[in-house]
C-alpha cells in the first residue's frame, strides 16, 4: 500500500466565488474516497466534479475532486480522503 499525497488548492472563479480542488496523487491501490464536506456533512454530489482515477506513470494513481464555494466561507469546507483504511481531512488554504 502506498498512501496518497493530498493537496488542496484554490483558484478564482466568478466574482465572489472560488474553485477549490483537492488532489490525491501517488497512491496504490487505486480504490480511494475523495470528497468535499461542508459544515461537517456530505456535500451533495451534484455540486462536486470528480476526475478519473488515472495511472501517474510510477505504478501509482492520481485523482481530484473540485467544487465552487463562496469566498469567505472557506473554513466551512474540508476535503476528506479515505484510502486502504486510513483517512485524513484537509482544509482550504487561506
Amino acid at each position: 500500500t502506498v498512501p496518497p499525497m493530498v493537496n488542496v488548492t484554490r483558484s478564482e472563479a466568478s466574482e465572489g466565488n472560488i474553485t477549490v480542488t483537492c488532489r490525491a496523487s501517488s497512491f496504490y491501490p487505486r480504490n480511494i474516497i475523495l470528497t468535499w464536506r461542508q459544515d461537517g456533512v456530505a456535500l451533495s454530489h451534484d455540486t462536486q466534479q470528480w476526475g478519473d482515477v488515472l495511472p501517474d506513470g510510477n505504478g501509482t494513481y492520481q485523482t481530484w475532486v473540485a467544487t465552487r464555494i463562496c469566498r469567505g466561507e472557506e473554513q466551512r469546507f474540508t476535503c476528506y480522503m479515505e484510502h486502504s483504511g486510513n483517512h485524513s481531512t484537509h482544509p482550504v488554504p487561506s
Epitope: D39, G40, V41, Q75, R76, F77, T78, E82
Partner: antibody, heavy 119, light 107 residues
Framework: DVQLQESGPGLVKPSQSLSLTCTVT?????????WNWIRQFPRNKLEWMGY???????NYNPSLKSRISITRDTSKNQFFLQLISVTTEDTATYYC????????????WGQGTLVTVSA | DIQMTQSPASLSASVGETVTITCRAS??????LAWYQQKQGKSPQLLVY???MLADGVPSRFSASGSGTQYSLKINSLQPEDFGSYYC?????????FGAGTKVEIK
C-alpha cells in the same frame, strides 16, 4: 482544551420561553467550529437542535425551526438557546457541544442541564 | 430525514464477554457515522467517528465496522467500566439524528 458549561433555569412554565446559556472556555467561538445544542429526553432519546457557527450562521433542526433561536455574545464567549412556546414535551437535559468541520460528530459535551416544563 | 435504528435496545452481559451493537440507517450514509458511550448521569462521550476510527483514548477492545446502511460496534472482553448506554449518530446530512440507544447491563 475546549470546555463547555450550560446554565439556565431548571423549571419553565408551559407556553413560556426556555433560555439557556453555554459558556465556552479554552477556545474562541469566533475562531472556528459549529457550536451546537443537543437535548436528551427523559426516556434517553437524543435530539440535535441546531448550531451557530464561528461566523454567526445558524442551522436548525426542521422539527424545531418555528420555535428555536440560537444566538451568541462574542464578548463573553457564550452562545444561547431560546425555545418559545414550550410544552411538557420539552422537558429534557440540554447539552451544548461543538464539532469541527472535518465531520459533524461531537468530541466534547457540556455536563448538561435539566429543564423541566411544568405548571 | 435519515432515521437510525439501533438493536438490541438492551442487553445483559458478563465481564469478559464480547458484545455487538448494531445500527441501521434508513438510507445510505456512506460511513458518516459516530458512536458514543454514556454512563448514568454523565454526558455522552465520543467513541468512534467516520464509522471505524477510534477517538483518542478509546481502548482497543472497542472496534467498529460497517458500510452503506448497516454499522456495528463491538466490545471485546467487556470490562466493568464499559457498562452504560451506547448511541449511534449519522452526519451524512442535516438534521443530524441519533439512534435510540442500547443499554449494556451487568448480568
Amino acid at each position: 482544551d475546549v470546555q463547555l458549561q450550560e446554565s439556565g433555569p431548571g423549571l419553565v412554565k408551559p407556553s413560556q420561553s426556555l433560555s439557556l446559556t453555554c459558556t465556552v472556555t479554552g477556545y474562541s467561538i469566533t475562531s472556528d467550529y459549529a457550536w451546537n445544542w443537543i437535548r436528551q429526553f427523559p426516556r434517553n432519546k437524543l435530539e440535535w437542535m441546531g448550531y451557530i457557527n464561528y461566523s454567526g450562521t445558524t442551522n436548525y433542526n426542521p422539527s424545531l425551526k418555528s420555535r428555536i433561536s440560537i444566538t451568541r455574545d462574542t464578548s463573553k464567549n457564550q452562545f444561547f438557546l431560546q425555545l418559545i412556546s414550550v410544552t411538557t414535551e420539552d422537558t429534557a437535559t440540554y447539552y451544548c457541544s461543538y464539532y469541527r468541520y472535518d465531520g459533524a460528530w461531537f468530541p466534547y459535551w457540556g455536563q448538561g442541564t435539566l429543564v423541566t416544563v411544568s405548571a | 430525514d435519515i432515521q437510525m435504528t439501533q438493536s438490541p435496545a438492551s442487553l445483559s452481559a458478563s465481564v469478559g464477554e464480547t458484545v455487538t451493537i448494531t445500527c441501521r440507517a434508513s438510507g445510505n450514509i456512506h460511513n458518516y457515522l459516530a458512536w458514543y458511550q454514556q454512563k448514568q448521569g454523565k454526558s455522552p462521550q465520543l467513541l468512534v467517528y467516520n464509522a471505524i476510527m477510534l477517538a483518542d483514548g478509546v481502548p482497543s477492545r472497542f472496534s467498529a465496522s460497517g458500510s452503506g446502511t448497516q454499522y456495528s460496534l463491538k466490545i471485546n472482553s467487556l470490562q466493568p467500566e464499559d457498562f452504560g448506554s451506547y448511541y449511534c449518530q449519522h452526519f451524512w446530512s442535516f438534521p443530524l439524528t441519533f439512534g435510540a440507544g442500547t443499554k449494556v447491563e451487568i448480568k
